[in-house]
C-alpha cells in the first residue's frame, strides 16, 4: 500500500513539475526591465525564450518574436535548448510511468516490469527536473552577469559620459516558476525511483528446492526416473536431482518467495 | 557593427520647430526599441522619449510632453524626432538610443549616437 501512495504521489507531483516546466518556457516575463528607469510613464520591457515584449502601464502590449536563429544569444539558444530537452524527457517519463502505476493493470504485466519502468521514468524525471532547474538557472546567471557588464562600462569614452541606460533587469516571473516545477519534478523522480524499490520482486541467488526424505513411499527404478511417490502420480516421468530431491514445479507451477530449502 | 547617426539640429527660435533624425545602420531597426536622449552643459544625460518596435507604444518625459513626437520608420531604419514650441530650456546636445530586443541577454545590450546640438535662442 505504501509502495502505491510513493509511486502514484511520485507520478502527480512529477505531472505538476512539467506541467510547471512547459508553462514557464512558453512564458515571457523571464526578465523583467523598467524601461529608461521612468517610474512616472511605467513601460516595461519583458524578454522570455520566444519573445520579447513593451507594455504600458494601461495594460497595451507590443511583442515580437525572436525571428532569426543566428543572431540569437548563444546562451539564450542553451536555455531553450535544456528547456526543450527537459520537456520531451518528462513527457517520455510521464508516458511510461502510467503504464508503471501499480493501481494501473495491463494484460500479465509482471511486478518486475512495472519495477523496471517505474525506475526508468523516476530517472528520466530526475534528468528532467535537472535540466530544467540548469537552464533557469543558466538564464538567471546571463542576467546578473550582462548587468554588472553594463554597470562597468556605464562611464566609459569621451570626457566620462554615461553609454548605458541604467536599466533595472529583475528576475521574471517564469524563473521561479521554472525553479519550483524543475524542483517538483526532481522530487516526483525521487520518489519514483523509491517506488520501484518496494516493487522489485525480492530474488534469490539460488534455485528454490525443496528436499524430502526417502520413505516407504517413494520406490525407484534403476533407470534413475521417479516411478510413484506419495504426493500423487507421476505423469510426466520427471528426472530425479540429488537422489531424492524433488523438483519443486511437479506442484506448483513457479517458486515462491515462502519455500524453504 | 551596429552605428546610430543622428541628424536635423541647428539654431532656432523660442517656439520654433526641428525634426531630428536617426539612422540606424548595420543591424534591423525593428529588432530595437529606440529612444531619445538630451543632455545639457553642465547636466546629467536625461530621458526625452522612446518608441516600441511597432511604433504602437511611445512615451516621453513629462518636460517634453504633447510637444515632442516620435516616430519610426522601419523600411527607411530611420527614427523621427519632431519638436514643436521650443523652449530655451530645452537647448542640448540630442543623443539617439537603440535598445536591444534581447536586454539584459545580450552584450552589448544597447547602442548610442554621436549626438546632434539643438540651440534654442531667446
Known amino acids: 500500500m505504501a509502495v502505491t501512495a510513493c509511486q502514484g504521489l511520485g507520478f502527480v507531483v512529477s505531472l505538476i513539475g512539467i506541467a510547471g516546466i512547459i508553462a514557464a518556457t512558453c512564458m515571457d516575463q523571464w526578465s523583467t526591465q523598467d524601461l529608461y528607469n521612468n517610474p512616472v510613464t511605467a513601460v516595461f520591457n519583458y524578454q522570455g525564450l520566444w519573445r520579447s515584449c513593451v507594455r504600458e502601464s494601461s495594460g497595451f502590449t507590443e511583442c515580437r518574436g525572436y525571428f532569426t536563429l543566428l543572431g540569437l544569444p548563444a546562451m539564450l539558444q542553451a536555455v531553450r535548448a535544456l528547456m526543450i530537452v527537459g520537456i520531451v524527457l518528462g513527457a517520455i517519463g510521464l508516458l511510461v510511468s502510467i503504464f508503471a502505476l501499480k493501481c494501473i493493470r495491463i494484460g500479465s504485466m509482471e511486478d518486475s516490469a512495472k519495477a523496471n519502468m517505474t525506475l526508468t521514468s523516476g530517472i528520466m524525471f530526475i534528468v528532467s527536473g535537472l535540466c530544467a532547474i540548469a537552464g533557469v538557472s543558466v538564464f538567471a546567471n546571463m542576467l546578473v552577469t550582462n548587468f554588472w557588464m553594463s554597470t562597468a562600462n556605464m562611464y566609459t569614452g569621451m570626457g566620462g559620459m554615461v553609454q548605458t541606460v541604467q536599466t533595472r533587469y529583475t528576475f521574471g516571473a517564469a524563473l521561479f516558476v521554472g525553479w519550483v516545477a524543475g524542483g517538483l519534478t526532481l522530487i516526483g523522480g525521487v520518489m519514483m525511483c523509491i517506488a520501484c524499490r518496494g516493487l522489485a520482486p525480492e530474488e534469490t541467488n539460488y534455485k528454490a528446492v525443496s528436499y524430502h526424505a526417502s520413505g516407504h513411499s517413494v520406490a525407484y527404478k534403476p533407470g534413475g526416473f521417479k516411478a510413484s511417490t506419495g504426493f500423487g502420480s507421476n505423469t510426466k516421468n520427471k528426472k530425479i536431482y540429488d537422489g531424492g530431491a524433488r523438483t519443486e514445479d511437479e506442484v506448483q507451477s513457479y517458486p515462491s518467495k515462502h519455500d524453504y530449502v | 557593427q551596429v552605428q546610430l547617426v543622428e541628424s536635423g539640429g541647428g539654431v532656432v527660435q523660442t517656439g520654433g520647430s526641428l525634426r531630428l533624425t536617426c539612422e540606424i545602420s548595420?543591424?534591423?531597426?525593428?529588432?530595437?526599441?529606440m529612444g531619445w536622449f538630451r543632455q545639457a552643459p553642465g547636466k546629467e544625460r536625461e530621458f526625452v522619449a522612446a518608441?516600441?518596435?511597432?511604433?504602437?507604444?511611445?512615451w516621453y518625459a513629462d518636460s517634453v510632453k504633447g510637444r515632442f513626437t516620435i516616430s519610426r520608420d522601419n523600411a527607411k531604419n530611420t527614427v523621427y524626432l519632431q519638436m514643436n514650441s521650443l523652449k530655451p530650456e530645452d537647448t542640448a546636445v540630442y543623443y539617439c538610443?537603440?535598445?536591444?530586443?534581447?536586454?539584459?541577454?545580450?552584450?552589448?545590450?544597447?547602442?548610442w549616437g554621436q549626438g546632434t546640438q539643438v540651440t534654442v535662442s531667446s
Open positions: 538610443h537603440a535598445e536591444g530586443q534581447f536586454g539584459a541577454l545580450s552584450y552589448p545590450k544597447d547602442y
Open positions: 548595420g543591424a534591423a531597426l525593428s529588432s530595437y526599441t
Open positions: 518608441i516600441s518596435w511597432g511604433g504602437s507604444i511611445t
